[in-house]
Each structure stands twice: as C-alpha cells, then as structure tokens.
Amino acid sequence: GCINITSSASQEGTRLNLICTVWHKKEEAEGFVVFLCKDRSGDCSPETSLKQLRLKRDPGIDGVGEISSQLMFTISQVTPLHSGTYQCCARSQKSGIRLQGHFFSILFTETGNYTVTGLKQRQHLEFSHNEGTLS
C-alpha cells in the first residue's frame, strides 16, 4: 500500500499545534510509530523525539481504504527556545518501513512574533505572538 507522511501547523490563540499525519491502510496501523523531532538531522528516532504516537489497529473502521493517523504536539506559548528545525517521521516495526517528512522550521523574530516555514500545505505561516492572529 502507499504510505506517506505530511506535516502541518495550526494556531489557536497563543497555542501552536504541530501536526504529523500518516496516511496508511487500516491493516498497516499495527506496529507503526509516528514521532516528531527537533534539530535532529540524522538521528531522529522515537527515543530522541519530542513526542511519539504508537498506532493501533481500529476494528471499528470498515473497509480497506486509506485512513489517517495524527500526532499533535501543542506548544502553549512559543518562545525563542522553540526556534529550530522540526521533522515528522514514522516507522513500522513490522515491515521495516521508515518515513521521513519534510523539514520545517520555527523562527522566533526580534519583534516577539514567530514564523513557521517549510510546510508543504502552506509554504509560509506567520503568527503574531501577542495578538494570536494568522497573517
């Protein structure tokens, strides 16, 4: 089956959600782990990740179509210490498949705002830290 991973971000007030989405077949969920790393160009693994999600097969989902599983990492208030390069990854302990998403970055600016760049869905997101608006 075709398995892929995408990265996205959303903002709710001061909160920034970093989202790793894995698209897979229902039967491929078992043994899959999705994880998010920061500033780890070569050694991104569940052990070195900021957060990981172990997928479970959901018997409640009918059919054999493609389904998605999401890992969401929420930062309540972005600070300069969050600046860096992030990557969504996934791997299967069963099949040995390893997925690596595109690198994306958080850059905290001197004005107290931050930008998220490198996301495939929207190439450039700019967030006002104080106002909580998306421009």
Epitope: K38, D39, T48, I75, Q77, L81, S83, G112, H129
Partner: antibody
C-alpha cells in the same frame, strides 16, 4: 527518575569567578532547553539565563549580561554557568531547571548550589 | 518588563479554611504558573498554564484568572500546604518573571 544535581558553589571574593555545573539524568537531556534561576537569602526567585536544547541560543537577564555565560555539553548531559566579575548582589542559591517543551513552566528543579560573594 | 505583584505577602489560615492568593501583572499575560517552595527545599511546579495542576498536587488546589489578574485557591487548608507560593509568567523579551512570593502559614 528525572534528576538535576548542581555542583561548584562556594565562597568567592568580589571580582573573581566561579563555574557551576548541573548534571542531568533520567530524561533525553539533548531535547530540552535548560535554565538557571537564583534565590538570594530570604528573597524571591529570579531567572538568570536559559539555553536552547542544542546550545546555539542563549538568553540572559540584563544584570548578568556580559558577566555570566550559560553553556551545555549534551554528550555529558550537563549544563554550566560560568560566573565572572562576581558582585555581592550575586550571592544566592542557584537552581538548575528544565524548560517544559510544551509550556513556559520550569518543570524540574535541582536542589540548588549556594554561591556567596564576599571579601 | 512585566512586573508581577503578589498579595498578600504573608497570610495565615486555619485547617479547613479557604485561602486565595492573587497575582497581578503590570500588563496582560497569556498564562500564569505557580510554584510551591518549603524552607530548605527547591521550588516545585504547582499549577501551570493558569489552571492545570502539576502531577501529585491535591485537588483542593485550583488556579484561575486571565489578562492581568490571576489567583491560586486552596479549598480546605491543610498543615502540609504551609509554604511560600510564587507566580511566574513568560513574556518577550524579559523572558521569565516571578512574583515576590506569598508566605502561607498554618494557624
């Protein structure tokens, strides 16, 4: 068990230097930004400095800028605070603390290292 | 720089009493965190993001507030709650700011 252990405190004369160390264990040290917070005798808490997870970015309170240097060695799971040109007002217990990644709370604290600056 | 003003500076309460400690910010802040510190010990995170209790904190504690006014409340004071409580916020560029602390004693 997550643990932070400070060392290197002591009595030092004004104008001299001292280096504090903080040994971390029980978590993936290289994933977390770290901080130093101090507390003068019978006084409140005061943030001193912070360092990013990779060590490339450092931040200081104005009163210590140019005198204190925060650094870390991720291969040794240790962070440091080099304190130069010490003043009597730097006398305090210095705590090593871990930044919570998802929040702005300082989630884990060490037991503290006492620094006395006096002639 | 945002200044946090805690009140009262010192207070005493009897077991079972309701206690409220307030923290006022000189400008609006997004969240407030609270720490508990006992004599000779390091501070412990107690309440984070205004209202979330840290692990192991009894549910007689609660936190609330928004903008410039925040509070920590103990519903039924117990002897083990006697400590100094500090509020803390994050703001750019001053980074981490703490209140001066409120010393809570048991009557």
């Amino acid at each position: 068990e997550v643990q932070l252990v400070e060392s290197g405190g002591g009595l030092v004369q004004p104008g001299r230097s001292l280096k504090l160390s903080c040994a971390a264990s029980g978590f993936t040290f290289s994933n977390y930004a770290m901080a130093w917070v101090r507390q003068a005798p019978t006084k409140g808490l005061e943030w001193v400095a912070s360092i990013s997870s990779g060590g490339g970015d450092t931040y200081y309170r104005d009163s210590v800028k140019g005198r204190f240097t925060i650094s870390r060695d991720n291969s040794k799971n240790t962070q440091y605070l080099q304190m130069d040109s010490l003043r009597s007002e730097d006398t305090a217990t210095y705590y090593c603390a871990t930044h919570n990644y998802e929040s702005t709370v300082l989630i884990t604290w060490g037991q503290g290292a006492s620094v006395t600056v006096s002639s | 720089e945002i200044v946090l003003t805690q009140s009262p500076t010192t207070t005493a309460a009897s077991p079972g009493e309701r206690v409220t400690i307030t923290c006022r910010a000189s400008s609006s802040v997004s969240y407030m965190h609270w720490y508990q510190q006992k004599p000779g010990a390091s501070p412990k995170p107690w309440i984070y993001e205004t209202s979330k209790l840290a692990s192991g904190v009894p549910d007689r504690f609660s936190g609330s507030g928004s903008g410039t006014s925040y509070s920590l409340t103990i519903n039924n004071m117990e002897a083990e709650d006697a400590a100094t409580y500090y509020c803390q916020q994050w703001n750019y560029p001053s980074m981490y700011t703490f209140g001066a602390g409120t010393k809570l004693e048991i009557k």
